[in-house]
Amino acid sequence: QEGSLPDITIFPNSSLMISQGTFVTVVCSYSDKHDLYNMVRLEKDGSTFMEKSTEPYKTEDEFEIGPVNETITGHYSCIYSKGITWSERSKTLELKVIKENVIQTPAPGPTSDTSWLKTYSIY
């Protein structure tokens, strides 16, 4: 039950600064152990935010949030479970919702690497 951690990412993944009123999708994934679990939980600041059944034959589980407001700002992580067997928490992703619209300019260079999006915590 140790080993790899679940992963957490966000789409649209151009920024962790989210404009108020928009929608975001948080994606939890657990590529090598997904089939061991039947529930996935999205936590915000250490408490349950959303929870749902996992989908068989998939390794990713999506949570759509929105339209967002400032109360969505916080630290998010994913946990997989089956009964009382819970995975480790994923690393933590910090989301910030801002009031004004953000003008987003594409970053130069390749855009496939989104690892910079993750804000790592102590977990």
Epitope: Q1, E2, G83, I84, T85, E88, Y123
Partner: antibody, heavy 118, light 107 residues
Framework: EVQLVESGGGLVQPGRSLKVSCAAS????????IHWIRQAPTKGLEWVAS????????YFRDSVKGRFTISRDNAKNTLYLQLDSLRSEDTATYYC???????????WGQGVMVTVSS | DIVMTQSPTSMSISVGDRVTMNCKAS??????VDWYQQKTGQSPKLLIS???NRYTGVPDRFTGSGSGTDFTFTINNMQTEDLAVYYC?????????FGGGTKLELK
């Protein structure tokens, strides 16, 4: 044979602290999540806290968040529950439990009584 | 949190009776309901996991059924050693929650 043995209970005044332990044997302790469940006198069962196999992730019921700390020492096969800022409603028998064969609480300790009273 | 409502809270029974108790979840918990037996002065013991699977060594007079929100636990041919409090618990959704218990007493 799987065994879970709790210790460290007693009488404590409101606002004070106590640390209870659970010594495990008969299984590979470091492979399993482990849990604390409590039962107030003449009342039902209530899940309190859980810790993942490595100890990196911990989970608490809302009423004890910020007051209780769960930890484990895999080298000593021991689980701990630190109870701080104790309240009278924390008075209960505290059981450690784990799920080895099923995703349920299939092994329980004998319980340790914690009484919070002035 | 999911609320597990157990009924009845107590039952007066005789040896040899068929005893049935129920547990209702406040929302769908699939088949993730377990049943525990607790005798006076003892720790709880797992009898049934995931609604209907009898735990190792549990006599076949104990059975469980149900899915979704409604679950049933049955003791066929009640024995004196079955006098206890029985609890259901859901583990489908965090946090795990227990029913209030059903106490079996002799008539």
């Amino acid at each position: 044979e799987v065994q879970l043995v709790e210790s460290g209970g007693g009488l404590v005044q409101p606002g004070r602290s106590l640390k209870v332990s659970c010594a495990a044997s008969g299984f590979t302790f470091s492979n399993y999540g482990i849990h604390w469940i409590r039962q107030a006198p003449t009342k039902g069962l209530e899940w309190v806290a859980s810790i993942s196999p490595s100890g990196r992730s911990t989970y608490f019921r809302d009423s004890v968040k910020g007051r209780f700390t769960i930890s484990r020492d895999n080298a000593k096969n021991t689980l701990y529950l630190q109870l701080d800022s104790l309240r009278s409603e924390d008075t209960a028998t505290y059981y450690c439990a784990t799920g080895i064969n099923y995703s349920s609480f299939d092994y329980w300790g004998q319980g340790v009584m914690v009484t919070v009273s002035s | 949190d999911i609320v597990m409502t157990q009924s009845p809270t107590s039952m007066s029974i005789s040896v040899g009776d068929r005893v049935t108790m129920n547990c209702k979840a406040s929302q769908n918990v699939g088949s993730h309901v377990d049943w525990y037996q607790q005798k006076t002065g003892q720790s709880p013991k797992l009898l049934i996991s995931t609604a209907s699977n009898r735990y190792t060594g549990v006599p076949d007079r104990f059975t469980g059924s149900g899915s979704g929100t409604d679950f049933t636990f049955t003791i066929n041919n009640m024995q004196t050693e079955d006098l206890a409090v029985y609890y259901c618990m859901q583990s489908n959704s965090y946090p795990p929650t227990f029913g209030g218990g059903t106490k079996l007493e002799l008539k």
